[in-house]
């Protein structure tokens, strides 16, 4: 294991990717931690402001966590020759507030990208495709994990927040081979309607820790290798029956309803009686109605459709103020 | 009005077993989580776990997984919770409370003292 | 999992004086939950989803607060609000947690 001392260098990474010497194969960049052994190079918490331009060519694992970022330009991990081996790249909490169209091309062999925990502002549509073609070439990544990347209310662009995430996973169909995806702590309000069709080889789905109100929108239909999606800690009211229908559709799954605080009126019926006879959500039982007053604490299954009731609403006649 | 009633003491020896008991009334038992809280004196609020008393399915804090075991009787409508291997430490009053995602309804709490 | 913290941990306050005191989060939660305990008495659920007050529970008192940072209000201090306030997590799923408590003296 060799490891470059904070002396050799403090001034930031100021050189080029294109203009960069090719790297000695067991070259270490300076403020970071290198193991050829293990093939991973780790450069955390050093308020580095740019990817290292000297990164050993060997390195399959990249932690970058921990840093100052602030913009990942295009091309930021392209070099000659290519990182061709790097695999797992991890930029969390590197106070990323914007990331460019093609920052991650010419990383043929990048499985898993963990962008978490970063304040992105923006999100370029190309972020992952790296071309603005109408179908670009496949991305090799296999888990993008994107959770609480919601910038603070004051940096947030004036287009919706939860648009911006959705055209990047969507542009050029580069994604269709991602298996993982992790969404978490997000505030997403809605989960824009057609990105789920563009991800058909999804397995893991996290949503949890959201806002989400409902998924009447959302179309679960063609995710037919999902195993798990993660639901839990949203603003769910009531899970419809065409929702309810493409989630017993899917062969394998295991959904995830945990802390949604559930409205136990007439709406809840249909949902009373699926999860009564689904395998599919798991602690189910634990399932808890908060509104309104008078059901509040209830477990769901065992509700009954004579508890499910609302009330009657009134002519506008009779409606007071 | 619902209700849970606890026993007001137990007195037990160290190294000995106790099962505690939760009699509820004025409410469908099996519709809400039971839940039993620990409190030593002056001390605070400690969950211990709770039960599910339609099915029971149970959930334990880690700490007293090898100490509680939660158990219910439906025709009674009745929850217990059998307290193992009892030490000084054990002693304090426990709870039993309705709840699910608050605890709407407490019992009296039962005092139990582990003296030699 | 989160770790509730409550502060102070004792106060006094005096009849009709304002009164408040807060719990804080070791990660952001949606809602709190409030439970009175008087001396020698088992907890009573006060305040609900951060802001709810329970039936029975007088006007004077008030909740809020948001993220990681909730506090319970009396607006003017009673001598039959001597008691133990405690926090709870908002969650329908184990663990479920509690504050340390703050103890409110009548001075």
């Known amino acids: 294991t060799s490891s470059a001392s904070s002396s050799s260098s403090s001034a930031p990474f100021l050189a080029s990717a294109a203009s960069a010497q090719p790297p000695l194969p067991d070259q270490c960049p300076a403020l970071c931690e290198c193991s050829e052994a293990a093939r991973t190079v780790k450069c955390v918490n050093r308020n580095l402001t740019e990817v290292p331009t000297d990164l050993p060519l060997y390195v399959r694992n990249l932690f970058l966590t921990g840093n100052q970022l602030a913009v990942l330009p295009a091309g930021a991990f392209a070099r000659r020759p290519p990182l061709a081996e790097l695999a797992a790249l991890n930029l969390s909490g590197s106070r990323l507030d914007e990331v460019r169209g093609g920052a991650f091309e010419h990383l043929p062999s990048l499985r898993q990208l963990d962008l978490s925990h970063n304040p992105l502002a923006y999100l370029s549509p190309f972020a992952f495709s790296g071309s603005n073609a109408s179908i670009s070439a496949p991305s090799p990544l296999v888990e993008l994990i994107l959770n609480h990347i919601v910038p603070p209310d004051d940096k947030r662009q004036n287009r919706s927040f939860e648009g911006m995430v959705a055209a990047a996973l969507v542009a050029g169909r580069a994604l269709q081979g991602l298996h993982l995806l992790e969404l978490a702590s997000n505030h997403f309000l809605y989960l824009p309607r057609d990105v789920l069709a563009q991800l058909p080889s999804l397995r893991y789905l996290d949503l949890s820790n959201n806002s989400l109100v409902s998924l009447t929108y959302v179309s679960f239909r063609n995710l037919t290798h999902l195993e798990s999606l993660h639901l839990e800690d949203n603003a769910l009211k009531v899970l419809h029956n065409g929702t309810l229908a493409e989630l017993q559709g899917l062969p394998h799954v295991r959904v995830f309803l945990d802390n949604n605080p559930w409205v136990c009126d007439c709406h809840m019926a249909d949902m009373v009686t699926w999860l009564k006879q689904t395998g599919v959500v798991q602690g189910k039982d634990r399932l808890t109605c908060a509104f309104p007053e008078k059901m509040r604490n209830r477990v769901l299954l065992e509700l009954n459709s004579a508890d499910l009731d609302c009330d009657p609403i009134l002519p506008p006649s009779l409606q007071t103020s | 009005q619902v209700q849970l009633q606890q026993p007001g003491t137990e007195l037990v020896k160290p190294g000995a077993s106790v099962k505690l008991s939760c009699k509820a009334s004025?409410?469908?038992?099996?519709?809400?989580?039971m839940h039993w809280v620990k409190q030593r004196p002056e001390q605070g609020l400690e969950w211990i776990g709770n039960?599910?008393?339609?099915?029971?399915?149970?959930n334990y804090n880690e700490k007293f997984k090898n100490k509680a075991t939660l158990t219910v009787d439906k025709s009674s409508s009745t929850a217990y919770m059998q307290l193992s291997s009892l030490t000084f430490e054990d002693s304090a009053v426990y709870y039993c409370?309705?709840?699910?995602?608050?605890?709407?309804?407490w019992g009296q709490g039962t005092t139990l003292t582990v003296s030699s | 999992q989160v770790v509730l913290t409550q502060s102070p941990a004792i106060m006094s306050a005096s009849p009709g004086e304002k009164v408040t005191m807060t719990c804080s989060a070791s990660?952001?939660?949606?809602?709190m939950h409030w439970y009175q305990q008087r001396s020698g008495t088992s907890p009573k659920r006060w305040i609900y989803?951060?802001?709810k007050l329970t039936s029975g529970v007088p006007a004077r008192f008030s909740g809020s607060g948001s993220g990681t940072s909730y506090s319970l209000t009396i607006s003017s201090m009673e001598a039959e609000d001597a008691a133990t306030y405690y926090c709870q997590l908002w969650t329908s799923k184990p663990p479920w947690t509690f504050g340390g408590g703050t103890k409110l003296e009548i001075r």
């Open positions: 990660s952001s939660v949606r809602y």
């Open positions: 039960i599910n008393p339609s099915n029971g399915n149970t």
């Open positions: 004025d409410y469908t038992f099996t519709s809400y989580w």
């Open positions: 409370a309705r709840g699910g995602w608050d605890f709407d309804y």
């Open positions: 989803d951060t802001s």
